[in-house]
Amino acid sequence: EEELQVIQPDKSVLVAAGETATLRCTATSLIPVGPIQWFRGAGPGRELIYNQKEGHFPRVTTVSDLTKRNNMDFSIRIGNITPADAGTYYCVKFRKGSPDDVEFKSGAGTELSVRAKPSAPVVSGPAARATPQHTVSFTCESHGFSPRDITLKWFKNGNELSDFQTNVDPVGESVSYSIHSTAKVVLTREDVHSQVICEVAHVTLQGDPLRGTANLSETIRVPPTLEVTQQPVRAENQVNVTCQVRKFYPQRLQLTWLENGNVSRTETASTVTENKDGTYNWMSWLLVNVSAHRDDVKLTCQVEHDGQPAVSKSHDLKVSAHPKEQGSNTAAENTGSNERNIY
């Protein structure tokens, strides 16, 4: 009679994470008598997966009834597969012995590969806001996928970006992998409504890539432009001066009026108007009693936007002449080292 052979017909098996893997194994003879055991890996460090004779293996079920005398099918199913289950599985026939069974013959092995979906990409931007015309870095991370092959793309408002670097780790063999990519994005004045998208394509996703997004509204700071103008006379001794604060983002803004360098009023932008591009406009006005001033008055509109150093614009109010419509004066004065008189 021909000697028993252990047949593992599948050289490799590919299973998606969470599914059940079937590892096939048949023997060509009933003799010698003895149990079958399944191992992952070979050599002294191999891991026992299933023992026909004894033990508790909750994730493993047999395909056929191993208690039947004439059974020669020793195939098993392993449930709820994870990337950690990847490896080469050996079906090994033992011969009954005393006191211990003796290994008789091993199958050629079946390599179990696990397909695991990448986690949802997480996109993060710079730690602080940046202004238009600057290039900032965004990172995208996704983890836990297998096999290693993966494609990552970056988009800004649907337009593909080319300036990025991507790494997949680890470099060598692993049960699962991670991807990390850094893209450089140029901010423009119109980016308040823009989005940066990281798109990950993998064999497990069946052509439906995963996307992570970042809103540039969380990254950009658009500094305001200031314009101070004098309005027509409201009453004989009163002049209305307005400070137009235009095209700023985010909304957080505090405005201070100074008369000859002395604080007259401070207010916080509340009832702003929103522009189509997502930036805001705001107007503040100051009623100046001209009769209270003997000399010309320097009115300064000082704005602190989003916690940045204050910027300001000044206007010289001529008291000596009869109050009339005046434009914004050129002379301006800083009142502190952290204040910038803009435009």
Partner: antibody
């Protein structure tokens, strides 16, 4: 008071790189941009780029085609400008200067660093 | 890139004279113009920004005006200490660009 202190003069061979530092003090480092401007002997001023220490955002003069790298170390309030693939025409005084983020007029300047490129 | 054409490239004037330097931008830069003074062997010094705003501590004899593409820098009464080279700079669109400079000398 506001100060920008730059590293000392450098002599480099063509093809080499130079890294100039600019240490800021007297103000909140992350609130202002640091710009780099160079001036060749007897020539005018040329803007190279800037970095915002808070966000790490940079703007570059494309004339330098990726030869300029600007980095910052917030722990030491220092900005670095590295210029690679040096050629003789890169011989110049390199200045760092401070500007309010988004407004770009440079109100405080470093003392300048002379970089000489010669074989 | 936006070109800043500065003129004249040099001028000679007497103490007390009114000195005017012009800068023309190749496209509209609104009012995003600064003027700097540079003395030999020294770093530039900001005098004017936002076309017309005077930097802290800068004497009032220095002034600026203009908008759009045409800008003017004026020294109302030239002083001996004003001998220097003056540069305009636009900061509307990157790369920020400077004019070629105007060397001011005293007769």
């Amino acid at each position: 008071q506001v100060q920008l202190v730059q590293s000392g003069a450098e002599v480099k061979k063509p093809g080499a790189s130079v890294k100039v530092s600019c240490k800021a003090s007297g103000y909140t480092f992350t609130d202002y941009e640091i710009h780099w401007v160079r001036q060749a002997p007897g020539q005018g001023l040329e803007w190279m780029g800037d970095i915002h220490p808070g966000s790490g955002g940079t703007a570059n003069n494309q004339k330098f085609k990726g030869r300029v790298t600007m980095t910052r170390d917030t722990s030491t309030s220092t900005v670095y400008m590295e210029l690679s693939s040096l050629r003789s025409e890169d011989t110049a005084v390199y200045y760092c200067a401070r500007a309010v983020s988004g407004y770009y007029a440079m109100d405080y300047w470093g003392q300048g660093t002379l970089v000489t490129v010669s074989s | 890139d936006i070109q800043m054409t500065q003129s004249p490239s040099s001028l000679s004037a007497s103490v007390g004279d009114r000195v005017t330097i012009t800068c023309k931008a190749s496209e509209d830069i609104y009012d995003r113009v600064a003027w700097y003074q540079q003395k030999p062997g020294k770093a530039p010094k900001l005098l004017i920004y936002g076309t017309a705003s005077l930097e802290t501590g800068v004497p009032s004899r220095f002034s600026g005006s203009g908008s759009g593409t045409d800008f003017t820098f004026t020294i109302s009464s030239l002083q001996p200490e004003d001998i220097a080279t003056y540069y305009c700079q636009q900061y509307w669109t990157t790369p920020w660009t400077f004019g070629g400079g105007t060397k001011v000398e005293i007769k």
